[in-house]
């Protein structure tokens, strides 16, 4: 049997990311003998559930079962039957459900209860569905990208396994943008924090990490747009909203009831003399940028330095991975290249936003109009958030890496969440064995 590989003992895990705009199911696998090693877990499948986020099913909870069926059945196909019963399934809900819980704890519990009952019907080892905190979302995103980048590995390599790896053990910061919230997480230079609420301490693989994190609820791209519309309609003279964040010639009717449905627009709510208004795009990046900046209150800061809305932010340090909607939007706009300067990004955004809507529709014929229409706003919002919100500069812009996947695994909180819940990130550095018994005999 010389040089014959023994069959590897493979383990699987499933995490459902119940986001504000949609739900995605991720399947991970790893060799059982190496589960305490760093970088051995990788994603084998992502299944995007058709439809909106679970919070939208609040009035139709009996449809949650069929909504989740296709992706759960896909997991049943991908994972060998012999492994089903020992495969853990976790569902984490993020800011969409945090917002629903703010409106009604009872309704949020009802949705989660039906989700739990639906997921319990499958042959996997269901471990529960819960709303994760913004702090957890930030922390697990940070763990995911650094795990995948090999930053927790004590073995120094003379080669680079991923494009962003600089061969040092300095961790990357994590920038996550969702539909309803955004997170910033990194290891600051100064280990003393002015704000204990934003401080996390980890011991991972024998090393201590003092991490800063904050999650800004209502500052995901979709909720930020609702906020901007609610703010701008306050000063509109009639039911026409001339909006610089949409392409010239774009028109869309918005129901005031939809606008005020979310808790994120409560601060702008007022009695309007109409039930609907029409957005008319004028496509002006500079004006859109100014409008977005009004969502960030920078006039008040009880600390040495703040992001916005009085939230402490230490000086930025090191490289950052920007993922989820940061990546999706910038990738659509073709602005993820390391070579594109911040000035160039701004120039491209000015050009993109000023393009007529009819022209845009022709250029991107395969893209759903609802999504297509919002890229001007989303791109402008990302620039505003990173530059004015988080204080990146033209110089530090080059430290932002827009990342979709690392080594085939999506950047996001789900992998870090599973690694934590399956105890696959040891506090101490595991003793390295010269050969694992799964190699060659």
């Amino acid at each position: 049997t010389q040089n014959k590989a023994l069959p590897e003992n493979i383990k699987y895990g499933i995490v459902l990311d119940a986001g504000s705009s949609h739900t995605s199911l991720y399947i991970y696998k790893w060799p059982a003998e190496k589960e305490n090693d760093t970088g051995v877990v990788h994603q084998v499948e992502e299944c995007r559930v058709k439809g909106p986020g679970i919070s939208k099913y609040v009035q139709k909870v009996n449809e949650i079962g069929i909504y989740l069926t296709d992706c759960m059945e896909r997991a049943r196909e991908v994972i060998p039957r012999s492994q089903h019963q020992e495969t853990p399934v976790y569902l984490g809900a993020t800011a969409g459900m945090r917002l629903l819980r703010m409106e009604s704890e009872e309704l949020a519990d009802r949705v989660l209860d039906v989700v739990e009952r639906s997921l319990s019907n499958y042959p996997f080892d269901f471990q529960g569905a819960r709303i994760i905190t913004g702090q957890e979302e930030g922390a697990y995103g940070w763990i995911t990208i650094n795990y995948l980048l090999g930053k927790f590995s004590q073995k120094t390599r003379w080669f680079s396994i991923v494009p962003y790896e600089t061969n040092n053990q300095e961790t990357f910061g994590a920038l996550d943008l969702g539909g309803a919230s955004t997170q910033i997480t990194f290891v600051p230079q100064n280990q003393t924090t002015e704000s204990p609420d934003n401080a996390l301490q980890f011991r991972l693989y024998g090393k201590d990490y003092n991490v800063y994190t904050h999650s800004f609820l209502c500052y995901g791209k979709d909720q930020a747009l609702w906020q901007k519309l609610a703010k701008d309609i306050q000063v509109a003279s009639n039911e026409i909203l001339r909006d610089p964040c949409f392409h010239p010639g774009y028109k869309k009717v918005v129901n005031v009831s939809d606008l005020y449905k979310t808790p994120c627009t409560k601060r702008f709510e007022m009695t309007l003399p109409f039930q609907q208004f029409e957005i008319q795009g004028i496509g002006n990046y500079q004006q859109c940028h100014q409008s977005v900046l009004e969502l960030f209150n920078t006039s008040y800061c009880p600390y040495s330095q703040c992001a916005f809305n009085g939230i402490f932010l230490p000086p930025l340090q090191g490289d950052f991975g920007a993922f989820s909607a940061f990546y999706f939007v910038m990738n659509f706009l073709n602005l993820t290249s390391e070579k594109v300067s911040q000035e160039k990004v701004t120039e491209m955004m000015k050009k993109f936003c000023s393009q007529p809507w009819e022209e845009i529709k022709t250029s991107y014929a395969g893209v759903k109009e609802k999504y297509l229409s919002e890229y001007c706003f989303s791109g402008t919002y990302i620039l505003s958030l990173l530059l004015q919100g988080y204080h990146f500069t033209a110089d530090s812009w080059e430290h932002i890496h827009f990342i979709g996947k690392i080594q085939g695994s999506d950047a996001g909180w789900t992998l870090g969440y599973m690694l934590n819940l399956t105890n696959m990130i040891p506090a101490e550095q595991p003793l390295s064995t010269p050969l694992s018994h799964s190699t060659y005999v």
Epitope: S21, K50, G51, K56, T69, D70, K370
Partner: nanobody, 124 residues
Amino acid sequence: QVQLQESGGGLVQTGRSLRLSCAASGDIFSINYMGWYRQAPGNERELVAAITGRGNTNYADSVKGRFTISRDNAKNTVYLQMNSLKPEDTAVYYCNAWDYSDYDEGPLREYDYWGQGTQVTVSS
């Protein structure tokens, strides 16, 4: 537009079986989900069984193990095989075809089509 036509309802005794059919016509390519709802007098309409475009199914707890939903894509027809019927299954059964919206505003469903309904009565 999609048109749905149910058939197969009727009066049966407890413990017997019925098979409902729902034939779809029109722009059925916009449809990913098909299912059966029922409404008993004085009650809300409730989802009984549903099937996805991939053929995966889901059932209300009250009918699990007794009812089976299936889909014949070639005939654009969805069926509900109802076995071991009980008096509490008495209701008007509606065929429904729909797809979910991907958006956080407006209605949950992007498309939503209903049949006229067929009466099922289970006598004891």
